[in-house]
Interface confidence: low
């Protein structure tokens, strides 16, 4: 039959070429002389000539060696024709297989594996996977079957096994406990590839294991003990820096320090606060230490990390004695404000009040007292007793220095400590109201027509209070009421000036008595131009001149 | 008003010593860290070190062995002090006030800087 | 030691347009236990001493006008100027307060346009 079963051929022959192969014969050469062809890839098309054929045996010929890795089978096509040329048989398939042969050894995807693991995992434990490729067939053959296996590990510590790799997986896994960063933090494996499933070619890689770290490692105080001198008062003083060490990975959460006090700080006067970089303990004063209340504290603080611990670990304690410093403390004012009320315009050297300040030092020290600020020098103060008395003429009035009735003087407390201290007391002087001004009219100086004059209304003002102003009462005085007639109107505080009688174009006095509830009377010259006009005027006018 | 005064630079010679002063006022002076910057001349920001409030200090990799810095709490003073002295020192030499005291107040920043002095190092 | 570069070296913006200064570090400044990025930026007028403009990276000094904001975390920082003002041309530096020691970038000068 016109058929060619499929033919195996191992790669890397060594030939003598043209090495026959099989023969193709067709049953019809009894009747004539057949020629026999090939064509397909590697007989008439790329890659061409690789294959041939004896035209009249039919012999199918390897012109040259074969590579499997490069093409593992050809198809090719066999036909048959008569002398004439015409074809006697239908084309033939042709499978030419190339089997494989050892050729090449495994190679790994990469020269160095990197993977890492947490430091303290039990044995089983899965850490990274490594490959190997392999040209090779490994699926009708063991040529390309790879097989892993660890050469050798760095370093040997705490021994020689501390890892294994699955012979077919390359997955690699901790076989022994005892995986500790802080002794040691990488390991180094040589890792190997064998093809013929371990029994042929070998190719070497590194496979490097670094260990990670896990918050086995307590920090612990180093000193344990400290001593400190803090100055009484100071808030945001820096106690002390609390050192530790920690084995853990620098500047990771198992290794960064959260530090607690835990006893000794009933008054939470102090805090404490991790320094980022150094990763000291900053132990602060929250709050101003007292020496007079308690010269010394005993604190002591845990330290842990930010990482809970993967085990059981002891807590490190430090113990702080803090030493209280005594600090010459100012006097202080009681109260720190003090509210007097006194009459204006009493006599010079009437006493006003006694103001005195407490040391809170222990020892009985001396206090003395100066004015510090007074601004219209109207107080005078005793340097021993404290005693305020009156130096000047208190005035409710004079709007300089006194608001809202309020005159504010500030004092001073020095003591006799070395160095002296100073406190400061401010001291409102709250001054009663007496009828000490009388009414004022305002304007003073008017300009009115002397033919139907309008009247003018004057406002009035008095500088004290009620009762000590309105009702007011106007009278004019010195002849003045024989042109003039005044009016008050109690509505708006207000005075009417009215021009009675004509009086030529000229300038005059008018005198305006006022006087308020509490009878305080106020003479007023009031400066009256009288204009010759109608009516309204604001300025008189220039006098006409005839043509 | 923060006040920051340096003051004692000046030429010196290759190898030479100096010693730059850093007068402080209108703060609390001793709860402040203080920091000495430099800035060679047409050149950016060098930070060369920094005393703590308890006189502990920190130094650039640069000056390190050579500069050291010390505090005066009592005269509200920072020196600078100068050994070894190289071209590559010359620079106009800037204190400056820590932000805050602590960490938590950005300790780190410097808020108030003094107008600066010019070392000059120079055979 | 951390590493602070800064960019562009020097920039030309128009009064009134916003201005833009990056600040890139070698290492992260972000602490992750407050979350605070320990990062500032200075301004330095000509013949005068810097003057701090931000700090934790976008805190904003007090007296400093609100046309300057920072913004960024980790390695990447920009200083932005809202608009700009003449008086706003100076040399900007940023400055790592990370760990010791502190660093600053090379500087980048603003004129106007």
């Known amino acids: 039959d016109w058929v060619v079963a499929p033919i195996s051929v191992p790669e890397n022959g060594k030939g003598p070429f043209p090495q026959r192969l099989n023969q193709l014969k067709s049953n019809k050469d009894r009747d004539t002389k057949i020629f026999y062809s090939i064509t397909g890839p590697g007989a008439d098309s790329p890659p061409e000539g690789v294959f041939a054929v004896e035209k009249e045996t039919g012999w199918l010929l390897l012109n040259k060696p074969l590579d499997r890795e490069e093409i593992a089978k050809y198809e090719l096509f066999g036909h048959a024709v008569s002398e004439n040329g015409a074809s006697v048989e239908d084309p033939m398939n042709i499978s030419i297989i190339v089997t494989d042969q050892n050729d090449h050894k495994p190679k790994f995807t990469q020269d160095t594996f990197r993977g890492s693991v947490l430091e303290g995992v039990l044995p089983g434990t899965s850490v990274m996977q490594v490959t190997a490729t392999d040209e090779d067939d490994a699926i009708h053959t063991y040529n390309g079957v790879v097989a892993y296996s660890i050469h050798s590990q760095e370093p040997k510590d705490p021994h020689d096994l501390m890892f294994t790799i699955h012979r077919s997986t390359g997955t690699i896994s901790v076989i022994s406990s005892g995986l500790d960063r802080e002794k040691v933090p990488e390991y180094t494996l040589t890792i190997q590839a064998t093809d013929m499933d371990g029994d042929g070619s070998t190719t070497t890689a590194v496979a490097v294991v670094e260990i990670l770290d896990a918050n086995d490692n307590a920090p612990v105080f180093d000193p344990q003990k400290y001593e400190s001198h803090v100055p009484e008062n100071a808030v945001g003083h820096e106690v002390q820096r609390l050192t530790v060490t920690d084995l853990d990975a620098p500047n990771s959460p198992a290794w960064r320090a959260t530090y607690l006090i835990v006893g000794g700080d009933d008054g939470d006067h102090f805090t404490i606060a991790t320094h980022p970089e150094s990763n000291q303990g900053i132990l602060t004063t929250r709050k101003g230490l007292d020496f007079e209340a308690k010269n010394q504290h005993t604190l002591y603080v845990e330290v842990t990390n930010e990482a809970p611990f993967v085990l059981k670990l002891p807590t490190s304690t430090a113990t702080i004695v803090v030493h209280v410093e005594d600090v010459n403390e100012a006097p202080v004012f009681v109260p720190p404000s003090k509210v007097v009320e006194v009459q204006e315009g009493i006599p010079t050297g009437e006493a006003v009040c006694v103001y005195t300040a407490k040391d809170p030092d222990k020892e009985n020290q001396k206090i003395s007292y100066r004015i510090l600020r007074d601004p219209a020098g109207w107080l005078a103060m005793d340097p021993d007793s404290g005693q305020v008395t009156v130096a000047g003429t208190l005035d409710r009035e004079d709007e300089r220095f006194v608001r809202n009735n309020i005159y504010e003087v500030m004092v001073l407390a020095v003591d006799n400590g070395s160095p002296p201290t100073t406190g400061t007391g401010t001291l409102l002087l709250t001054l009663i109201d007496v009828n000490d001004h009388g009414p004022v009219p305002e304007p003073r100086e008017i300009t009115i027509c002397n033919q139907s004059p309008e009247s003018q209304v004057l406002n009035i003002t008095d500088k004290d209070l009620s009762p000590h102003t309105s009702p007011f009462q106007a009278q004019l005085t010195d002849d003045s009421d024989i042109y003039w007639m005044a009016e008050v109107n109690e509505k708006d505080d207000t005075v009417v000036l009215s021009l009675k009688k004509f009086l030529k174009q000229d300038t005059y006095d008018v005198h305006l008595s006022l006087s308020d509830h509490g009878n305080k009377e106020q003479l007023t010259v009031i400066r009256a131009t009288v204009c010759d006009c109608h009516g309204h005027v604001e300025k008189c006018p220039d006098p006409w001149k005839g043509g | 008003e923060v006040q920051l005064l340096e003051s004692g630079g000046g030429l010196v010679q290759p190898g030479g010593s100096l010693r730059l002063s850093c007068a402080a006022s209108?703060?609390?002076?001793?709860?402040?860290?203080i920091n000495w910057v430099r800035q060679a001349p047409g050149k950016g920001l060098e930070w060369v070190g920094v005393?703590?409030?308890?006189?502990?200090?920190n130094y650039a990799s640069s000056v390190k062995g050579r500069f050291t810095i010390s505090r005066d709490n009592s005269k509200n003073t920072v020196y600078l002090q100068m050994n070894s002295l190289r071209a590559e020192d010359t620079a106009v030499y800037y204190c400056?006030?820590?932000?805050?005291?602590?960490?938590?107040?950005?300790?780190?920043?410097?808020?108030?800087w003094g107008q600066g002095t010019l070392v000059t190092v120079s055979s | 030691d951390i590493v602070m570069t800064q960019s562009p070296d020097s920039l030309a913006v128009s009064l009134g347009e916003r201005a833009t200064i990056n600040c890139k570090s070698s290492?992260?400044?972000?602490?992750?236990?407050?979350?605070?990025?320990?990062f500032a930026w200075y301004q330095q007028k000509p013949g005068q001493p810097p003057k701090l403009l931000i700090y934790?990276?976008?805190t904003r000094e007090s007296g400093v006008p609100d046309r300057f904001s920072g913004s960024g975390s980790g390695t990447d920082f920009t200083l932005t100027i809202s608009s700009l003002q003449a008086e706003d041309v100076a040399v900007y530096y940023c400055?790592?307060?990370?760990?010791?020691?502190?660093?600053f970038g090379q500087g980048t000068k603003l004129e106007i346009k």
């Open positions: 400056a006030k820590s932000r805050g005291v602590y960490d938590f107040d950005g300790r780190g920043a410097m808020d108030y």
């Open positions: 209108g703060f609390s002076f001793s709860s402040y860290p």
């Open positions: 005393i703590w409030t308890g006189g502990g200090t």
């Open positions: 290492q992260s400044l972000l602490y992750s236990s407050n979350q605070k990025n320990y």
């Open positions: 934790w990276a976008s």
């Open positions: 400055q790592q307060y990370y760990s010791y020691p502190y660093t």
